[in-house]
Interface confidence: medium
């Protein structure tokens, strides 16, 4: 029946610890007498038997979902509007695999097994950005910001850790950034400063290490932003 179809991308790739939203639409004719029945949608892992296995996500409130995907996989779309969009946050390696959607409305029940979504979870290659506003002068305090702008709002907030031999204290913290107040000494020049970010929802960690450039106030103040390209190389942007 050409009226029975599901439209979703064949595969999606997400880095470990990050998030993805997969748009999805489904169609299925239903008998007139079920027009007022609620529409329940379910995402199942491939290989699941509907009567035996819990779904990874559903909008049915009294339906148990798989323990390992609870709170991370959400049926974000509204099935009553033919929307089966799936949200995955805190992606984990074990989320790798294929998933199929099932709809139930009254006596009409259908698993869209010929159009499955393949989820690929890859290594976290993104690294934190470290912002140093202006030159680091000996014995003068500066606010260094470590941020992960590529992380998503819906995920479990990351945990920031700083490592430095220089005298430091923690400043303001937002969901995706942490400020370190550093008061470098002349002997801290050339030493390492590391910002480590752990994504507890997936148990994955990423970090960036820079070398402190401590010098007496220069004529030409600059802002160093350590960005990198995820390859492990460090770039310096001067502004």
């Amino acid at each position: 029946d050409p009226r029975v179809r599901l439209e979703v991308q064949e595969s999606v790739t997400v880095q470990e610890g990050l998030c993805v939203l997969v748009p999805c639409t489904f169609f299925h004719p239903v008998p007139y007498h079920t027009r007022n029945s609620p529409v329940h949608g379910y995402w199942f892992r491939e290989g699941a038997i509907v009567s035996l296995d819990s779904p990874v996500a559903t909008n049915k409130l009294d339906q148990e979902v798989r323990e390992e995907t609870q709170g991370r996989f959400r049926l974000l779309g509204d099935p009553s509007r033919n929307n089966c969009s799936l949200s995955i946050v805190d992606a984990r390696r074990r989320d790798n695999g294929s998933y199929f959607f099932r709809m139930e409305k009254g006596s009409t029940k259908y698993s869209y097994k010929s159009t499955q979504l393949s989820v690929h979870v890859t290594d976290l290659t993104h690294r934190p950005q470290i912002l140093i506003p202006g030159a680091l002068d000996p014995d003068h305090s500066k606010n260094l910001t470590c941020s992960v702008p590529w992380a998503c709002e819906q995920g479990t907030p990351p945990i920031f850790s700083w490592m430095s031999a220089a005298p430091t204290s923690l400043g303001l913290r937002t969901t995706h950034s942490s400020v370190l107040i550093i008061t470098p000494r002349p002997q801290d020049h050339g030493t390492n400063l590391t910002c480590q970010v752990k994504f507890p929802g997936a148990g994955v960690t990423t970090e960036r290490t820079i070398q402190l450039n401590v010098s007496y106030a220069s004529q030409n103040p600059r802002t160093d932003i350590f960005l990198g390209d995820g390859s492990g190389k460090q770039g310096v942007v001067q502004g």
Epitope: R94, K109, K113, S114
Partner: antibody
């Protein structure tokens, strides 16, 4: 091309256990569920249970609950079925089969298990 | 568990005949039904999945139909290699097989 290769013939005493292996080659082992199905001589097919290797969770037919254990070793792409407290009526050919949608699309060659005193 | 009842249990037919095997479920199973063929000493082979979808590599003379509780496997023109035992199996609630239909040469 995907293949399911099972371990060889077994002869067991009543009351003992048997463990049959099923090695998957030619495809991603953990993406699919693997079921075990048995067939007594001259009889029909009977589903015993199945495992989804990527999760490691198994489900069993009510008849075999408590007597069968299905496991999977992702490192060797091998599924196992262990049946305990064997009796003569467990004499059968045991097949592993790969789930594809709502069907078994690929089957192992079968393992004959004879239970005799 | 859902019971599947196949009929007939055995059937004699000739090459070129059109053959129909039915499978009735004890309760509705939507379209979660497959048909497989088994020859003596061999593992079963998938023919039809999702009640009516033909497995790749299976000749088009095989077709499946039905939904809910009543399903049919049809072989439009029997070939010598089609003489075997046919099983239906359901995947809607746990997994169960029909008792089989043995197709013999008349």
């Amino acid at each position: 091309q995907v293949q399911l290769v099972q371990s060889g013939t077994e002869v067991k005493k009543p009351g003992s256990s048997v463990k049959v292996s099923c090695k998957v080659s030619g495809d991603t082992f953990s993406s699919y569920a693997i079921s075990w199905v048995r067939q007594a001589p001259g009889q029909g097919l009977e589903w015993m249970g199945r495992i989804i290797p990527i999760i490691g969770i198994a489900n069993y037919a009510q008849k075999f609950q408590g007597r069968v254990t299905i496991t999977a070793d992702k490192s060797t792409s091998t599924a196992y079925m262990e049946l305990s407290s064997l009796r003569s009526e467990d004499t059968a050919v045991y097949y592993c089969a790969r789930h594809w949608l709502d069907a078994f699309d690929i089957w192992g060659q079968g393992t004959m298990v004879t239970v005799s005193s | 568990d859902i019971q599947l009842t196949q009929s007939p249990s055995s059937l004699s037919a000739s090459v070129g005949d059109r053959v129909t095997i039915t499978c009735r479920a004890s309760q509705g199973i939507s379209s979660a039904l497959a048909w497989s063929q088994q020859k003596p000493g061999k593992a079963p082979k998938l023919l039809i999945y999702d009640a009516s979808s033909l497995e790749s590599g299976v000749p088009s003379r095989f077709s499946g139909s039905g939904s809910g509780t009543d399903f049919t496997l049809t072989i439009s023109s029997l070939q010598p290699e089609d003489f075997a035992t046919y099983y239906c199996q359901q995947f809607n609630s746990s997994i169960t097989f029909g008792q089989g239909t043995k197709l013999e040469i008349k």
